[in-house]
Amino acid sequence: CKAMHVAQPAVVLASSRGIASFVCEYASPGKATEVRVTVLRQADSQVTEVCAATYMMGNELTFLDDSICTGTSSGNQVNLTIQGLRAMDTGLYICKVELMYPPPYYLGIGNGTQIYVIDPEPCPDSDF
């Protein structure tokens, strides 16, 4: 089979600070040295890119400085963290993995992780 399987959790609940973490694991059909990982958000039928990073196997995953994502990699597993989430960001987050080099190229699309974000209640005023 030439398809690349990507696994990710079905559901994740963001923290009260709007941070969600999940693992994206891929079954590499070949020995890739350069991998690109992209987080996509699917809302209705619209798909948008949340963040993306390319990394060399054995090296750290580096997102752009202004990215809302951070991550670490270990073998065929990527630990992804998305920050700054609000309730309106609740949705399906898809992990996309591309084995860029060496040939052949492979594409892997996960089934998506439903991230639930609940905005914290504002703290009531308190008298001291």
Epitope: A3, M4, T38, L40, T54, I94, K96, M100, Y106, I109
Partner: antibody, heavy 118, light 108 residues
Framework: EVQLVESGGGLVKPGGSLRLSCAAS????????MHWVRQAPGKGLEWVSF????????YYADSVKGRFTISRDNAKNSLYLQMNSLRAEDTAVYYC???????????WGQGTMVTVSS | EIVLTQSPGTLSVSPGERATLSCRAS???????LAWYQQKPGQAPRLLIY???SRATGIPDRFSGSGSGTDFTLTISRLEPEDFAVYYC?????????FGQGTKVEIK
């Protein structure tokens, strides 16, 4: 408007060269991998070449390997195909196509005709 | 290389009838990586279905895709006059990207 517009096709003699261009507009070009696909008269679709986001990685069909070179200029939102040592069997309509975020080719240009004949 | 074989080569159908097109892969293709395109004479291909069964933006619901592994199907439930065209399947999970040879749907 989101679109791709090819140019550079024409009539060329066997052994000659041609450079095709594809101008992208209406989307963030650097966020997408791109392809060239061709279609010989009365025939089906044939994938020709692929280029990664930053242009560092390129893949080619065996039929064009060593003769065609794909490149991109993200600053100019443009994709290119340099075709050398052209043969009669390279005669086709050449399309540039965008890879959607989920993988299929969701945006195509109108095509440019390349005819290789003496 | 994954070889995609489409059948039939030509399908003659009357408007309003159902059309069923087949695409068989030489080896297993993940259902996430199979697409269908429509092409009319003188026009560029248009994406219809991706991920084997998801309709692309703006595609009417009379088009549906199904299948997994090596066998995939495109079904047009009720053919409209504008549906008479050539249809191609494609796998995009690994290089080289490959297309089927096409099925022409013509008016009976």
């Amino acid at each position: 408007e989101v679109q791709l517009v090819e140019s550079g096709g024409g009539l060329v003699k066997p052994g000659g060269s041609l450079r095709l261009s594809c101008a992208a507009s209406g989307f963030t070009f650097s966020s997408y991998t791109m392809h060239w696909v061709r279609q010989a008269p009365g025939k089906g679709l044939e994938w020709v070449s692929f280029i990664s986001y930053d242009g560092n990685h390129k893949y080619y069909a065996d039929s064009v390997k060593g003769r065609f070179t794909i490149s991109r200029d993200n600053a100019k939102n443009s994709l290119y195909l340099q075709m050398n040592s052209l043969r009669a069997e390279d005669t086709a309509v050449y399309y540039c196509a965008r890879t959607s975020l989920l993988g299929p080719f969701d945006l195509w240009g109108q095509g440019t005709m390349v005819t290789v004949s003496s | 290389e994954i070889v995609l074989t489409q059948s039939p080569g030509t399908l003659s159908v009357s408007p309003g009838e159902r059309a069923t097109l087949s695409c068989r892969a030489s080896q297993s293709v993940g259902s996430s990586y199979l697409a269908w395109y429509q092409q009319k004479p003188g026009q560029a291909p248009r994406l219809l279905i991706y991920g084997a069964f998801s309709r692309a933006t703006g595609i009417p619901d009379r088009f549906s895709g199904s299948g997994s592994g090596t066998d995939f199907t495109l079904t047009i439930s009720r053919l409209e006059p504008e549906d008479f065209a050539v249809y191609y399947c494609q796998q995009y999970g690994s290089s080289p990207w490959t297309f089927g040879q096409g099925t022409k749907v013509e008016i009976k």
